[in-house]
Interface confidence: low
């Protein structure tokens, strides 16, 4: 039943331009080339866009036409080594214009960065968007496309494309509204903290293909389709498994047009067959494509069938353990990941990994045993500390951002992380506590059965940004070794990590902690990150401060900030008060 | 992490055959594709060929019909036969391995072609 099998095409820029349409076509091209090429202008882009586009029209129209046979990477990538400033903007990327097909394309995917030095977006007047928007709408959303797509090279395409159009759509209602900004400014927040959200999570899942391998993102599949679709047989989860793999693994390889093809027969596949897999997707499937695809991917999880079996009786008490494993062993682990999996919603995905692996490591010891079923006899019991870790991690935490509230939480969490790996830049190690510290307001308001796996799950999305930023230039083994030693174990590894010893404190400098009247006029969010700077900085040069003694200087630092924010002269204070703290700061901390 | 290991190489005479064997171990299950480089002083690396973990296999147009690539799963290891070789495929030729790219690399082993 594999949706993805297709006849050959004599022309594939033909086939996905007439599967696509011109449109999703244009803007898949346009996100393929802002995601590689990051730093060129947006009309450079446009350009060679326009020129793939009247290209693949020409192949349209005669699929034998010269060049129209050529694979979709040789087309784009002998495009895109036509930008003639390659050399002097890219360095050494340039390089892989000299390489042939596969090789050249790898070569563009290893040169994406995560954090590419970019300007901040800047939100533009809401009469400025709108007079540009009704300008030229087309152009306008292009350049939405192009910005968003340069600044995360591995957001998930074809759900780009669903963020254009809930962007167009704002646009469209609210530059007619009575208040404009009223109307169109919540709606921007949401969509900029929904689409940072999506494309962290995609980055997980490119991160775990390209690091960890297919079979590893086909576990984290396995367990995250039985959660949502219980009632499905394992044939069918393993048939979308199998179909949601190609799909991602095209769209972390640049393969966006294959991607969005697939991911469109995907969903279309799923609604044909919603009776054998889910009851939840009724709703889902009465929606226009892009909403639809987004629709699935997040749906409730259906009902667990109400007779589900003890699992004992296939995967501990049979006689026939060792012989169904040793005949096929990633479908007996996959059957057993699936069966328990749909069992526990109430499981991060991560946690029945590490479970499907201790599995794993008992049969492959006891299988080779003298009394194998005496061996394996006790295996549930060794799940035990494995569930209750992660649920008493979640108690604590979720106890003291009860307690402290959000941003003293992301305080905490600054704290404990920069005594943790303290050599990580601090601009990461804010970035990345910030996140972190979001868990509370995301996660402790569920019940039990759902905390966890919005918690522990939300978290493996943010240790992986940790990990890919660290990646780009790695300053700690710490990090490195939580990072690549085990995808499932990331967070426990993060979790058991104690101040580091070995680090040596950084020099006090004076200039870091020297602030100034601009800091009044930045928003709550901004000026908070310049406070959690602050703090990052203040734990580098005194690692062994207590909580009592960082409190008590970030209470005077916002006593600061608050007194001379209401001084006449602003800068004269700032300047003297200033003085004054550092000094007191020093002596509190006995720098 | 993966390891790779190549062996095999050494001097032939031009329209002579050699097999390089490059064998793999460390996390191995990630790898879902193995590949031969070579790079001749003074040059770019170079594509020599590719299998993927389905069997399906890739060459350059230079080495097409002169050398194979193939695979024994049980052994965990690539070879790369070639045939009718020519002076100018004299290099240090690397396997490389990974997921979904080559991101893991041997040390190389030498192949020289005398005329």
């Known amino acids: 039943r594999g949706v993805f099998r297709r006849d050959a095409h004599k022309s594939e820029v033909a086939h996905r331009f007439k599967d696509l349409g011109e449109e999703n076509f244009k803007a898949l091209v346009l996100i393929a080339f802002a995601q590689y090429l990051q730093q060129c202008p947006f009309e450079d882009h446009v350009k060679l866009v326009n020129e793939v586009t009247e290209f693949a029209k020409t192949c349209v129209a005669d699929e034998s036409a010269e060049n129209c046979d050529k694979s979709l990477h040789t087309l784009f990538g002998d495009k895109l080594c036509t930008v003639a400033t390659l050399r002097e903007t890219y360095g050494e990327m340039a390089d892989c214009c000299a390489k042939q097909e596969p090789e050249r394309n790898e070569c563009f995917l290893q040169h994406k960065d995560d954090n590419p030095n970019l300007p901040r977006l800047v939100r533009p007047e809401v009469d400025v968007m709108c007079t540009a928007f009704h300008d030229n709408e087309e152009t306008f959303l292009k350049k939405y496309l192009y910005e968003i797509a340069r600044r995360h090279p591995y957001f998930y395409a074809p759900e780009l494309l669903f963020f254009a159009k809930r962007y167009k759509a704002a646009f469209t209602e609210c530059c007619q509204a009575a208040d404009k900004a009223a109307c169109l400014l919540p709606k921007l927040d949401e969509l900029r903290d929904e689409g940072k959200a999506s494309s962290a999570k995609q980055r997980l899942k490119c991160a775990s293909l390209q690091k960890f391998g297919e079979r590893a993102f086909k576990a984290w599949a396995v367990a995250r389709l039985s959660q949502r679709f219980p009632k499905a047989e394992f044939a069918e989860v393993s048939k979308l498994v199998t179909d949601l793999t190609k799909v991602h693994t095209e769209c972390c390889h640049g393969d966006l047009l294959e991607c969005a093809d697939d991911r469109a027969d995907l969903a279309k596949y799923i609604c044909e067959n919603q009776d054998s897999i889910s009851s939840k997707l009724k709703e889902c499937c009465e929606k226009p494509l892009l909403e639809k695809s987004h629709c699935i991917a997040e749906v409730e999880n259906d009902e667990m069938p109400a007779d589900l079996p003890s699992l004992a009786a296939d995967f501990v008490e049979s006689k026939d353990v060792c012989k169904n494993y040793a005949e096929a062993k990633d479908v007996f682990l996959g059957m057993f990941l699936y069966e328990y999996a749909r069992r526990h919603p109430d499981y991060s995905v991560v946690l029945l990994l590490r479970l499907a692996k201790t599995y794993e490591t008992t049969l492959e010891k006891c299988c080779a045993a003298a009394d194998p079923h005496e061996c394996y006899a006790k295996v549930f019991d060794e799940f035990k500390p494995l569930v209750e870790e992660p649920q008493n991690l979640i108690k604590q935490n979720c106890e003291l951002f009860e307690q402290l509230g959000e941003y003293k939480f992301q305080n905490a969490l600054l704290v404990r992380y920069t005594k943790k790996v303290p050599q990580v830049s601090t601009p990461t190690l804010v970035e990345v506590s910030r996140n972190l510290g979001k868990v509370g307001s995301k996660c402790c308001k569920h019940p039990e059965a759902k905390r966890m796996p919005c918690a522990e799950d939300y978290l493996s999305v943010v240790l992986n940004q940790l990990c890919v930023l660290h990646e780009k230039t790695p300053v700690s083994d710490r990090v490195t070794k939580c990072c690549t030693e085990s995808l499932v174990n990331r967070r426990p590894c993060f979790s058991a990590l104690e101040v580091d010893e070995t680090y040596v404190p950084k020099e006090f400098n004076a200039e870091t902690f020297t602030f100034h009247a601009d800091i009044c006029t930045l928003s709550e969010k901004e000026r908070q990150i310049k406070k959690q700077t602050a703090l990052v900085e203040l734990v580098k040069h005194k690692p062994k401060a207590t909580k009592e003694q960082l409190k008590a200087v970030m209470d005077d630092f916002a006593a600061f900030v608050e007194k001379c924010c209401k001084a006449d002269d602003k800068e004269t204070c700032f300047a003297e008060e200033g003085k004054k703290l550092v000094a007191a700061s020093q002596a509190a901390l006995g720098l | 992490q993966v390891q790779l290991v190549e062996s095999g190489g050494g001097l032939v005479q031009a329209g002579g055959s050699l097999r390089l064997s490059c064998t793999a171990s460390?996390?191995?299950?990630?790898?879902?594709?193995m590949a031969w480089y070579r790079q001749a002083p003074g040059q770019q690396r170079e594509f020599v060929a590719r299998?993927?973990?389905?069997?399906?296999?890739n060459y350059p147009d230079s080495v097409k019909g002169r050398f194979t690539i193939s695979r024994d799963n049980a052994k965990n290891t690539v070879y790369l036969q070639m045939n009718s070789l020519k002076p100018e495929d004299t290099a240090v030729y690397y396997c490389?391995?990974?997921?979904?790219?080559?991101?893991?690399w041997g040390q190389g082993t030498q192949v020289t072609v005398s005329s």
């Open positions: 460390g996390s191995i299950e990630s790898i879902n594709r």
């Open positions: 299998i993927s973990k389905g069997g399906s296999t």
């Open positions: 490389a391995a990974g997921p979904v790219w080559e991101q893991f």
